[in-house]
């Protein structure tokens, strides 16, 4: 039985040209996290973080994605096209797969705030 819960940074906004941290956190389970996958709204992979072997940053994002902090991901040099959904997929043993959702809005305005509160989707 899957007892865990994914907490995410929920809906966040950031300024064009700036950077943003995408974070998910798995709680309420003793399952071992073997891998965390980060995907974009069009289902393309940004990065994979294997618990033991480290990070794999996908070619299209190598210049703009920095691993971390932790199991999270830092997306840099934001463009308006980065607006949309992002998903973290936690592969765990023995529970299986947990998935969290973050919505990022990239704003032209210099008053864009980056909120870092955690939400349970």
């Amino acid at each position: 039985m899957m007892t865990g819960t994914i907490e995410t940074t929920g809906n966040i906004s950031a300024k064009k040209g700036g950077s943003v941290i995408l974070q998910c956190h798995l709680s309420s389970t003793m399952a071992q996290v073997t891998q965390v996958n980060w995907e974009q709204h069009d289902h393309s992979l940004l990065a994979i973080r294997n618990a033991e072997l480290g990070w794999h940053i996908y070619p299209a994002f190598k210049d703009r994605v920095a691993p971390g902090p932790g199991l999270g991901l830092t997306l840099q040099s934001l463009t308006m096209n980065d607006t949309g959904e992002y998903f973290c997929t936690y592969h765990t043993y023995p529970d299986g797969t947990y998935r969290g959702r973050i919505f990022l809005e990239v704003l032209e305005s210099s008053v864009a705030e980056h909120s870092a509160r955690f939400q349970i989707p």
Epitope: T34, H43, L53, W55
Partner: antibody, heavy 119, light 107 residues
Framework: EVQLQQSGPELVKPGASVKISCKTS????????MHWVKQSHGKSLEWIGG????????SYNQKFKGKATLTVDKSSSTAYMELRSLTSEDSAVYYC????????????WGQGTTLTVSS | DIVMTQSHKFMSTSVGDRVSITCKAS??????VAWYQQKPGQSPKLLIY???YRYTGVPDRFTGSGSGTDFTFTISSVQAEDLAVYYC?????????FGGGTKLEIK
């Protein structure tokens, strides 16, 4: 030039253990993960597991847990795989394969080590 | 475990022909797929990754495409030296798994 040089062919008896080595050169050993892949005769490839030489962290295919143990010796830039309680099912060619930088594709491969388990 | 199915174990083609090898994942694997070539008596060689990027030095007649569960590897104009077995592999979820291989035979 990156090179992965594996140890020679092994002929061992059922129940025994064997340790295959993969000596690397031409790059910084601790910066890239090393993987091991099994290829039974005329068959496909199976991922056994991988090791992060920097910290010794390992990720195994559950199927090979208890069968294979992956280690490294940083001082000699060598990766090892020990296989235990050998049976005829373990007879195969075993490859070490190095990933790219922040990439899981196996960019460089050893030449393979043929293991024959027979009484 | 995710099963990668290459429906054709063998494919026969002629020099100059276009040939496509397909690979189907039993579960969603996004774009976490690579393709390898193994010539007789040799170690496998990375050709394509992620799943449409050619590795350094790989001729441009080799291309890859796909996303989700369905992937295709194409040789636009087969050469005699392309005689080999081609494998797909997923690294979306451990254990990372390979397809059964497709042996390309030249008529």
């Amino acid at each position: 030039e990156v090179q992965l040089q594996q140890s020679g062919p092994e002929l061992v008896k059922p129940g025994a253990s064997v340790k295959i080595s993969c000596k690397t050169s031409g790059y910084t050993f601790t910066e890239y993960t090393m993987h091991w892949v099994k290829q039974s005769h005329g068959k496909s490839l199976e991922w056994i597991g991988g090791i992060n030489p920097n910290n010794g962290g390992t990720s195994y295919n559950q199927k090979f847990k208890g069968k294979a143990t992956l280690t490294v010796d940083k001082s000699s830039s060598t990766a090892y795989m020990e296989l235990r309680s050998l049976t005829s099912e373990d007879s195969a060619v075993y490859y070490c394969a190095r990933s790219g930088h922040m990439d899981y594709g196996y960019v460089y491969w050893g030449q393979g080590t043929t293991l024959t388990v027979s009484s | 475990d995710i099963v990668m199915t290459q429906s054709h174990k063998f494919m026969s083609t002629s020099v100059g022909d276009r040939v496509s090898i397909t690979c189907k994942a039993s579960q969603y694997v996004s774009t976490a797929v690579a393709w390898y070539q193994q010539k007789p008596g040799q170690s496998p060689k990375l050709l394509i990754y992620s799943p449409s990027y050619r590795y350094t030095g790989v001729p441009d007649r080799f291309t890859g495409s796909g996303s989700g569960t369905d992937f295709t590897f194409t040789i636009s104009s087969v050469q005699a030296e392309d005689l080999a077995v081609y494998y797909c592999q997923q690294h979306y979820s451990t254990p990372w798994t390979f397809g059964g291989g497709t042996k390309l035979e030249i008529k």
